[in-house]
Structures are given as structure tokens and as C-alpha cells.
Interface confidence: low
Amino acid sequence: VMVGTGVAAQNGILIKGGKPLEMAHKIKTVMFDKTGTITHGVPRVMRVLLLGDVATLPLRKVLAVVGTAEASSEHPLGVAVTKYCKEELGTETLGYCTDFQAVPGCGIGCKVSNVEGILAHSERPLSAPASHLNEAGSLPAEKDAVPQTFSVLIGNREWLRRNGLTISSDVSDAMTDHEMKGQTAILVAIDGVLCGMIAIADAVKQEAALAVHTLQSMGVDVVLITGDNRKTARAIATQVGINKVFAEVLPSHKVAKVQELQNKGKKVAMVGDGVNDSPALAQADMGVAIGTGTDVAIEAADVVLIRNDLLDVVASIHLSKRTVRRIR
């Protein structure tokens, strides 16, 4: 066992003692969390589509409001949106956000104020006078305007419907277009008006498909679990060759999904980065944390992949088989 864990450590796989090492070869199902595990976990905004009246809510104003709202979010998508808005507006300063609420698996709501300063002072091309931009409605001259407070909702279809907004079929189709590519599409409503769609992509890790294929060829069932909607989840799963998908799973329900498989007599390995999945890592027969993950995940896991390489999941199972064979 010591030799096995030693060899693993030399290869960037930390196995916490003999028990997980002996368990690894019994694993019949590997459940991968999507964000940060199958994907890089560094989402980026791919598209901002304005849906409302551009004169009333021009792009810059939408970006200022959305960037401020999402700045209070700890969700990776929120971080990506805020980063994008800051870059596009050429500012590090945002407005004020109050009454912030985040509903896992749905979206956020809050009140945003003090964005006038951003719109007045954020970067603009030196050779393009502000007056030109005003004509286009892309930079309202709001320096002296009465500070406005915007009521903001950002999230999935369900979240906006729950808050009384109607989503037309063409907006839903635009979202579906992105979701079919494995992207996450979120909607933005300001003051009760649907005014934008943001498409966010998180690239799949290069080795993911090979890791999945190798596990399947070893007779291991591979499952994808995610809080994302079914279309996005299915698109990512298809890219990497996973057939079984648990989508729209709330963070608190990931443990239940692991238990569900265990109740069918399966030995389950859960692979995740610890964002929303630490309890599931602890519940699994073998919890595998990828090295870039959170401290909580590394604590909860039986195996830590220091190199953040999914092929090391395969390597740990191989190593377990070889070690157990030697012991016997």
C-alpha cells in the first residue's frame, strides 16, 4: 500500500491511505461534476444580445447595471459577467448593489444604483466625441441626471418566469441556439423589462473525452452531474462521450444523486473541484478532488489530483488494480 501511494504521489496523485487505494479498483461508476472538472471552470462571455429598446437601455447601461449586480455574486458565471462588463466599460469601478438575493440554480435579484458615474467617466474613444455616441444612444449623458435605482433580475428562464416575466419564443430560441453548443444562456430584466441575453461558455478540457472513453473501455459507467439546464449539459456530455446526464441538480441534491447510485449497489467515485460538490465528494465511495479545487474539497476527498488532469482519474484506478493484485 505504501509503495502504491508513493508511486501515485510521484505522479501527482495524492491517495489518502490504504482504504481509498483498495477501493479504487472496485469503482463501477464515475460521476463527474461539469463546471471546473469536465470544463476548465473559467467561463467567459461569448455574446451579449440586447432585447429591449436600445434607446432606453443601451448596451453600456445594461453592462453597467449587470456588472454591478453580478459583482455581488460568488457564482463563476457571475464573476465572468462582471469581468466582461468591466472590460467593455473600461472601468474597475461599479455602482452600488443592495437587496441582493441569489437563488441557487435559478439566478439573482437586486437593486442597482450609482451607475451614472461609470457611464459618464468610463473609457470612450478619444476621437469620438460623446455627442456622437449620444445620438446612437450608446452613451447617455447622465452626469447631471437624478441618480436612478434599477430593479435587476438575472438568471434562467424559470427564474424570470417566477418573477412574472414572459419569455417569447424567439428569445427562447436564441437561448436554445447557445445551449445546444454547450453554452449557458442567461436572461437580464431591468425594471420588469426583459432587456438582454448573455451567452457564457466554459471550454471543455482537452483530455476529458479521452478520460471518459478510457473509463468506459474499462467497464466503468460515466455520469455527468451539473446544475446547468438539460440542453447545455447534454451538449457538453455529447462533446466528451458521456451518455448519462443528471442536469439541473441543485448543489444540495448532488449527495442524493450519489446515494441513489449507491443504493443500487454501485461503488461510486465522485470527481469535482469542491464548488457546490464537497458533500457529494464525502458521500462517494471514492471522492476525487481536482487540484485547483477548494480547500474544503481537498479535505473531503480521498484522492487529490494535483495536476488537474482527468486522465489521472484513470491512472488512480489502474494503480489501485495493480497494487491490489500485488497484495493478493
Epitope: 461569448m46 473600461g90 471550454a203
Partner: antibody, heavy 117, light 111 residues
């Protein structure tokens, strides 16, 4: 009808400056990227830079401050300084969707810039 | 910075035949599929054929097919017509490209 049209291309002497303009119609610059691409005679397409919906601009590494992109409500200008014979090319502007990775779905017809003494 | 490398030019095809053009990206393109294909005829502007690696642009005949993911992409033209004689370019993202987001181009000669 949505379109882009380049103008301002002409013969310039080496070391000179020139501004070519991309005029758009039928859509709002506040929702799209505009990219500038050039094509030397018999050569491939070469990206120069991009102007974002908010007016932010990004350039290819060889530009080194010689070229500047700016925009108004309906035009995007490419100002070129310190021109050399190697800058002789047809200059195209093209539209990309609301992000930095959208495809270029609409192109202007191009304007020819000739740098020669 | 992303670099797109295309099949060396030119490629010959007979009318009614099939031609395949390859485009290799280093590193992989955004979201593994953020790649488009263009057709350009002499003296004309480029025309979008395929986006998202495999989605046919509006008005483009279904003879044109895009495939691939990550780093390897292919444009296949089946039932080649005389009108398909052109140079074909692949392209990736543009905002912070630093290097050229366009491939070097592949000339298709129809015999």
C-alpha cells in the same frame, strides 16, 4: 438592409498617413463588433484590429501604435500612420456579433490603399 | 495566441467530386467549436459559409459541410461545382488575437 461600406482608400507616399472609414447602415454599432482586415495583393486575410460595442479597441501585435481604430454612431475609422509599401492592400471592415468570438457575418466590399513613391 | 494552419494550397477537384480542406488550431478554439469558414473569390469580399464549426450560414448550399472540434477542423465540399473555385479561409476569435485569427487560406481549383 444591413451593410458596411469602406471608403478613403487612395495612393499615399511612404511615411504618410491615411484614414479609411467603414460606414454601417441597418444596424447599431452599440450591439456589434467591427473588425478591420487587410489583404495584400495575392495574399491571405490579415486581421488588424477590432472595435467593441462600447468603443474599446484591440489590435494585432504588429500594429505597434501605427494604426488607431475609433468610432462614431455610424462609422468606424482606421487611422494609419507611418505607412510603408508593405501596407499596400485592400482594407475590409466586417461585422461580428455581440462578443469577441462571434463569426464575421457581414463584410464591406473593401477599399484599396496603395503606398508607393 | 491562437494560430490557425490550413492545408497547403492549391487543392484540385473535379466537377462533381469532393474536396476536403483542413484547419488546425493551436491551442484549441474557444468552447472547442468557435471556428468559422469563409469563401473568397478573386476581387470579391469574403463570404461566411460555416460558423460554430458546423452550422451552415444562411443561403449556403448544403454541399458545404463543416466538422471537427478542439484543434482539428474540416470543410468538405461535395458535388463540387465550377462556381466553388475560390480561396477558403478558416477563422477563430478576434478580440485579443494578437496573432491573425485567420488561417492562411486554401485555394480550390476546379477542373
Amino acid at each position: 438592409c444591413q451593410s458596411l461600406e469602406e471608403s478613403g482608400g487612395r495612393l499615399v507616399t511612404p511615411g504618410g498617413s491615411l484614414t479609411v472609414t467603414c460606414t454601417v447602415s441597418g444596424f447599431s454599432l452599440s450591439s456589434y463588433w467591427i473588425i478591420w482586415v487587410r489583404q495584400a495583393p495575392g495574399e491571405g486575410l490579415e486581421w488588424i484590429g477590432s472595435s467593441g460595442p462600447s468603443g474599446s479597441a484591440y489590435y494585432t501585435s504588429w500594429v505597434k501604435g501605427r494604426f488607431t481604430i475609433s468610432k462614431t454612431s455610424t462609422t468606424v475609422d482606421l487611422k494609419m500612420t507611418g505607412l510603408t509599401t508593405e501596407d499596400t492592400a485592400t482594407y475590409f471592415c466586417a461585422r461580428a456579433g455581440g462578443s469577441d468570438y462571434d463569426w464575421f457575418d457581414l463584410w464591406g466590399q473593401g477599399t484599396l490603399v496603395t503606398v508607393s513613391s | 495566441a491562437q494560430v490557425l494552419t490550413q492545408t497547403p494550397s492549391p487543392v484540385s477537384a473535379a466537377v462533381g467530386g469532393t474536396v476536403t480542406i483542413n484547419c488546425q488550431s493551436s491551442p484549441s478554439v474557444a468552447n472547442n467549436n468557435w471556428l468559422s469558414w469563409f469563401q473568397q473569390k478573386p476581387g470579391q469580399r469574403p463570404k461566411l459559409l460555416i460558423y460554430g464549426a458546423s452550422t451552415l450560414a444562411s443561403g449556403v448550399p448544403s454541399r458545404f459541410k463543416g466538422s471537427g472540434s478542439g484543434t482539428q477542423f474540416t470543410l468538405t465540399i461535395s458535388d463540387v461545382q465550377c462556381d466553388d473555385a475560390a480561396t477558403y479561409y478558416c477563422a477563430g476569435g478576434h478580440k485579443t488575437a494578437e496573432k491573425n485569427p485567420f488561417g492562411g487560406g486554401t485555394e480550390v481549383v476546379v477542373k
